[in-house]
Amino acid sequence: MSSKYPRSVRRCLPLWALTLEAALILLFYFFTHYDASLEDQKGLVASYQVGQDLTVMAAIGLGFLTSSFRRHSWSSVAFNLFMLALGVQWAILLDGFLSQFPSGKVVITLFSIRLATMSALSVLISVDAVLGKVNLAQLVVMVLVEVTALGNLRMVISNIFNTDYHMNMMHIYVFAAYFGLSVAWCLPKPLPEGTEDKDQTATIPSLSAMLGALFLWMFWPSFNSALLRSPIERKNAVFNTYYAVAVSVVTAISGSSLAHPQGKISKTYVHSAVLAGGVAVGTSCHLIPSPWLAMVLGLVAGLISVGGAKYLPGCCNRVLGIPHSSIMGYNFSLLGLLGEIIYIVLLVLDTVGAGNGMIGFQVLLSIGELSLAIVIALMSGLLTGLLLNLKIWKAPHEAKYFDDQVFWKFPHLAVGF
């Protein structure tokens, strides 16, 4: 096959990204200031540790989790970092403008950084469905649209349904999954002949993807408990998430073996299934009254994740053009829905027990929230997909999908590969 030179993003990316960064700096200059009131330095350190856990999850966890492609591992890790850095900046401003702007200034606290990191994490979950098929300029667009959509979704849910930070952020799993899938659906799908090998996984990148999964596994309790209001709720969330992810690891590895005719364990299944419990338990992690329930939920989530990884990739590859190893999208969509259903079940049990006759109303509110999250995810995802298809972004040629050499300088390789 004749060599197809990559479409250069030299004119497009630096101008676009640096102009945007300059605009962000100006916005920070005019509209933000630090919270100068912290009296208790020990409290500051404790609060920072949660934010640090979230940053590790985002930069190392999701960065490496998506790096399993044979020839796209560099781009996966670095693009994730780029999106995280940009996403956090925009999320801090957006959250500030939406929640505290009447006072004229956005006050930046450790909590607002925590919130912004979680918002940016949404993009890193979604992008798994499109990594390898887009360049950095397109990813900048995706970051801006998704963070804006999620920020507005959270504000609308908070105002209409009166939910707290934790509840409106826990829609992130479903939102990110459906956003990513709808963007992927809009992008050119078929892989041209001769490039099929590029979306296959390789041993060393797969090992780094496993490292990413381990980091996510370790810090998932921090993610699920980060926005809860009281120490007892945080404690419950940490414990329940820990039990759920512990069981989902055992289920993932044994279930993967069970799903293979020769009883072999699939790396791809394990990468995502180890996190299944954390996603499924997310919405209700502070409500689950005992460990065994969290463990059962982890078990069910692990089985759903392995089952999904076995049967859904074929469908996703045909319909959405998502490679077999990028299973985070449909995984999170199924598990996120499971988590929301568990939350509604707990709500019903509570309301029945209270005997105040408001079951229908409470369930209706929860279904309304979930529906709104899915609708906004699909609509904003489709909008993003259409935007990414514009010629101005100089998207990589289909023959150059999943190829680090399009974006990175490798001195030891021949020029003009």
Epitope: D35, L38, E39, D40, G43, L44, A46, S47, V50, S99, T109, L110, F111, R114, S158, N159, I160, F161, N162, T163, D164, Y165, N168, R229, S230, P231, I232, E233, N236, S284, H286, L287, I288, P289, L346, L347, L349, D350, G353, A354, N356, M358, F361, Q362, L365
Partner: antibody, heavy 128, light 110 residues
């Protein structure tokens, strides 16, 4: 017993600053969110600000946003309210209150929140 | 910011029953707002009566009860007594951030 004692009130000119303190005793201060609530003479109660148990998050009423700052020092069991650019309409008795959380779910571990313990209040008068 | 509405004043005969309500300027009050009720007599700090919609605080007589009536939170006093003559405030928790007090109801026991 659980006790909250406010201090720092007084007479101050418009545009000036004042810092209120609330000393807590009889409970684990670092485990509870704290509120400031005020009551202008002859008027109803008005919520002013809240700070989470670990100081990580704060919220303010629109009427004080950008002028008042709530903070806490868990090592000293003390809550603060820094009031800048004071106006005549800020004249009130200022109460601090503990945010208590109680299990509201009969089956789940759901919690709900309310203000259960109040201080006796400190009076702030803004007048020229 | 959301406005929480209460009846400015209410009268009840001794031994009678009175229901004070707490609504939102826009929307319905549900358990998600953690409605709570406070009693205040002149010159005193508020005292918690009801929290989490319908849970009585310790030491509060059982003639006080809380509920959701239609789209409002409600405080019902059955068998009103002379010392129930006070100001009653409801407070709603607004999801991610602020709390809002109602304007208060001045209850007179005639």
């Amino acid at each position: 017993q659980v006790q909250l004692v406010e201090s720092g009130g007084g007479v101050v000119q418009p545009g000036r600053s004042l810092r209120l303190s609330c000393a807590a005793s009889g409970f684990t201060f670092s485990s509870y969110g704290m509120h400031w609530v005020r009551q202008a003479p002859g008027k109803g109660l008005e919520w002013v600000a809240v700070i989470w148990y670990d100081g990580s998050n704060k919220y303010y009423a629109d009427s004080v946003k950008g002028r008042f700052t709530i903070s806490r020092d868990n090592s000293k069991n003390t809550l603060y309210l820094q009031m800048n650019s004071l106006r005549a309409e800020d004249t009130a008795v200022y109460y601090c209150a503990r945010e208590f959380y109680t299990r509201s779910g009969l089956w789940s571990q759901g919690y709900s929140y309310y203000m259960d313990v109040w201080g006796k209040g400190t009076t702030v008068t803004v007048s020229s | 910011q959301t406005v929480v509405t209460q009846e400015p004043s209410f009268s009840v005969s001794p031994g009678g029953t009175v229901t004070l309500t707490c609504g939102l300027s826009s929307g319905s009050v549900s358990a998600r707002y953690y409605p709570s009720w406070y009693q205040q007599t002149p010159g005193q700090p508020p005292r918690t009566l009801i929290h989490s919609t319908n849970t009585r605080s310790s030491g509060v007589p059982d003639r006080f009860s809380g509920s959701i009536l239609g789209n409002k939170a409600a405080l019902t006093i059955t068998g009103a007594q002379a010392d129930d003559e006070s100001d009653y405030y409801c407070v709603l928790y607004m999801g991610s951030g602020p709390w809002v007090f109602g304007g208060g109801t001045k209850l007179t026991v005639l």
